[in-house]
């Protein structure tokens, strides 16, 4: 029996009842000419079941018997081959089971193409199995609402199949979508059944509908695009991160700094260091060293990993993040315990605002990568 379900998304209006989609290709039932074939359509709560073959309504005749959820074909002929569907219409939605019937003398084992994901791609369908359009990969279509920041690229997909190969056209808010409707136009890749708009702007907001059709039928699917205008702001750091940590000598520890920033952020991990036995320079400013920063040669800059720590690694670690609008900083303390002492629950240490206000970075060429002297702004 079929082990998949599909509801054709034939509505242009987003307020229509919910739909479900087929994930895999329709199951194929093979019969030799003259044989009888019986297929059971298992749909729950089916008030009314209707049947189609290649998108055309199927009624009973002298060889086709429709009883409840059963379809019987007596004395099958090659002309019975095609895409069959049974649809259960309910008050809240409709659901359809699809399956292929192939009546042939030559029962072979399919294609030996070295393909990976090709069912999603366009594949030309030769032969006489005329088929109404159907969705081939609904996982690509599940996300209907796309909220995209301005200036980003958006891609809508409607992977489909059918024979003859269906055509695809796009509507915006129910009307034909033309290249001149947006600055820079848009890209359509029929090969991959998709529409791409680059550098989206607020006027691109709306409903986008793909209509996939051939002479045997038409299906469509609607996406809603919301363009979120960027409001420039300095980086935001997740509260409580980095978190205070403790470990034993020789242990490993990780500090994490979670950054939210529309503009490209620059992340630095900074530590107080000593020079000539002193933590502060003659001007009273602390010596600070940049341990890690974001950039091409730095993996995941939001994480600072310390391995095989020594007592000298104990102290305050600052996560400083800046973008072109401003900066934000948060810090955590590392406690390094002697080997025999197991780490207990870390006590929260809160730096006093007075201290933070006075904290400045100083530059000292005697230390590699020591941060430029400048005032840190601290934000709650």
């Amino acid at each position: 029996r079929p082990s998949f379900s599909l509801v054709e998304d034939t509505t242009l209006e987003p307020e229509e009842p919910p739909t479900k989609y087929q994930i895999s290709q329709p199951e194929v039932y093979v019969a030799a000419p003259g044989e009888s074939l019986e297929v059971r359509c298992l749909l729950k709560d089916a008030a009314v079941i209707s049947w189609t073959k290649d998108g055309v309504h199927l009624g009973p005749n002298n060889r086709t018997v429709l009883i409840g959820e059963y379809l019987q074909i007596k004395g099958a002929t090659p002309r019975d081959s095609g895409l069959y569907a049974c649809t259960a219409t309910r008050t809240v939605d409709s659901e359809t089971w699809y399956f292929m019937v192939n009546v042939t003398d030559a029962i072979s084992s399919g294609d030996d193409e070295d393909d990976t994901d090709g069912a999603e791609d366009f594949v030309s369908e030769n032969g006489n199995n005329k088929r109404a359009p159907y969705w081939t990969n609904t996982e690509k279509m599940e996300k209907r609402l796309h909220a995209v920041p301005a200036a980003n690229t958006v891609k809508f997909r409607c992977p489909a199949g059918g024979n003859p190969t269906p055509t695809m056209r796009w509507l915006k808010n129910g009307k034909e979508f033309k290249q001149e409707h947006r600055i820079g136009g848009y890209k359509v890749r029929n090969q991959h059944w998709s529409l791409i708009m680059e550098s989206v702007v607020p006027s691109d907001k709306g409903n986008y509908t793909c209509v996939v059709e051939n002479e045997y039928g038409s299906i469509n699917h609607t996406y809603h695009l919301d363009v979120v205008e960027r409001s420039p702001h300095r980086p935001i750091l997740q509260a409580g991160l980095p978190a205070n940590a403790s470990t034993v000598v020789g242990g490993d520890v990780e500090f994490v700094c979670k950054v939210y920033s529309d503009a490209q952020p620059h992340i630095q991990w900074i530590k107080h260091v000593e020079k000539n036995g002193s933590k502060y320079g003659p001007d009273g400013l602390p010596y600070l060293k940049v341990l890690k920063h974001s950039g091409i040669n730095s993996s995941n800059a939001e994480v600072l990993a310390l391995f095989n720590v020594t007592e000298a690694d104990a102290g305050e670690y600052i996560c400083k993040v800046s973008n072109y609008i401003g900066q934000a900083n948060q810090s955590a303390w590392l406690t390094v315990l002697p080997k025999q002492q197991a780490p207990g629950r870390e006590k929260e240490i809160t730096a006093s605002p007075d201290y933070l206000e006075k904290l400045e970075f100083r530059h000292d060429s005697g230390l590699n990568d020591i941060f430029e002297a400048q005032k840190i702004e601290w934000h709650e």
Epitope: D114, T116, D121, F122, S124, R189, Q191, E198
Partner: antibody, heavy 117, light 107 residues
Framework: QVQLVQSGAEVKKPGSSVKVSCKAS????????ISWVRQAPGQGLEWMGY????????HYAQKFQGRVTITADESTSTAYMELSSLRSEDTAVYYC??????????WGQGTLVTVSS | DIQMTQSPSSLSASVGDRVTITCRAS??????LAWYQQKPGKAPKLLIY???ILQSGVPSRFSGSGSGTDFTLTISSLQPEDFATYYC?????????FGQGTKVEIK
């Protein structure tokens, strides 16, 4: 087993054009798009453009727009990439690659194009 | 175009090490990301597509994860044949872009 076999190495003068071929065997040529990707010596990979033979679609990277032409001959299952107005920085290995649902799953062996006066 | 920032640009590791390479997109690319391995003088070889799906014939020590803008390729236990350059590819936008590559060298 699908294979993409490319034409041999070329040495070209600045200002001239080069046309590299990519012949597919062992699969359905028209069912897939073919992209061209190049790699300058010691550098990374750079996508140039693609052709979808059956759909008749081509799209080129902005950097190569107006200088590159990608064509296909379905009767011989061959794709072509022609790059004009060659300069020394076009010296690179040029690859054709088959798209299986957008990513590239099968690559040609590469064709070295040297641009030198 | 969508920019792909790959890091680190190179790393030294020993056989048996766990290796992680990251790729960050300049905007969300859903899960439209593939990873390739390239050895000197050879064409790139597809390892992973759709962020985490292992290409047929690729050893299971390779794995991919992530979504949106941040992606990771992990080699759980580095083998001698894994020393190569690795590239990420975004195919969300049809102006495809690769990361600049990560060279994995023997320590």
């Amino acid at each position: 087993q699908v294979q993409l076999v490319q034409s041999g190495a070329e040495v070209k003068k600045p200002g001239s054009s080069v046309k590299v071929s990519c012949k597919a065997s062992g699969g359905t040529f028209s069912s897939y798009a073919i992209s061209w990707v190049r790699q300058a010596p010691g550098q990374g990979l750079e996508w140039m453009g693609y052709i979808s033979p059956y759909m008749g679609e081509t799209h080129y990277a902005q950097k190569f727009q107006g200088r590159v032409t990608i064509t296909a001959d379905e009767s011989t299952s061959t794709a072509y990439m022609e790059l004009s107005s060659l300069r020394s920085e076009d010296t690179a290995v040029y690859y054709c690659a088959r798209e299986s649902y957008e990513y590239f799953d099968i690559w040609g062996q590469g064709t070295l194009v040297t641009v030198s006066s | 175009d969508i920019q792909m920032t790959q890091s680190p640009s190179s790393l030294s590791a020993s056989v048996g090490d766990r290796v992680t390479i990251t790729c960050r997109a300049s905007q969300s690319i859903s899960n439209d990301l593939a990873w390739y391995q390239q050895k000197p003088g050879k064409a790139p070889k597809l390892l992973i597509y759709a962020t985490s799906i292992l290409q047929s014939g690729v050893p299971s020590r390779f794995s991919g994860s992530g979504s949106g803008t941040d992606f990771t390729l992990t080699i759980s236990s580095l083998q001698p044949e894994d020393f190569a350059t690795y590239y990420c590819l975004q195919y969300y936008d049809y102006s495809y872009t690769f990361g600049q590559g990560t060279k994995v060298e023997i320590k």
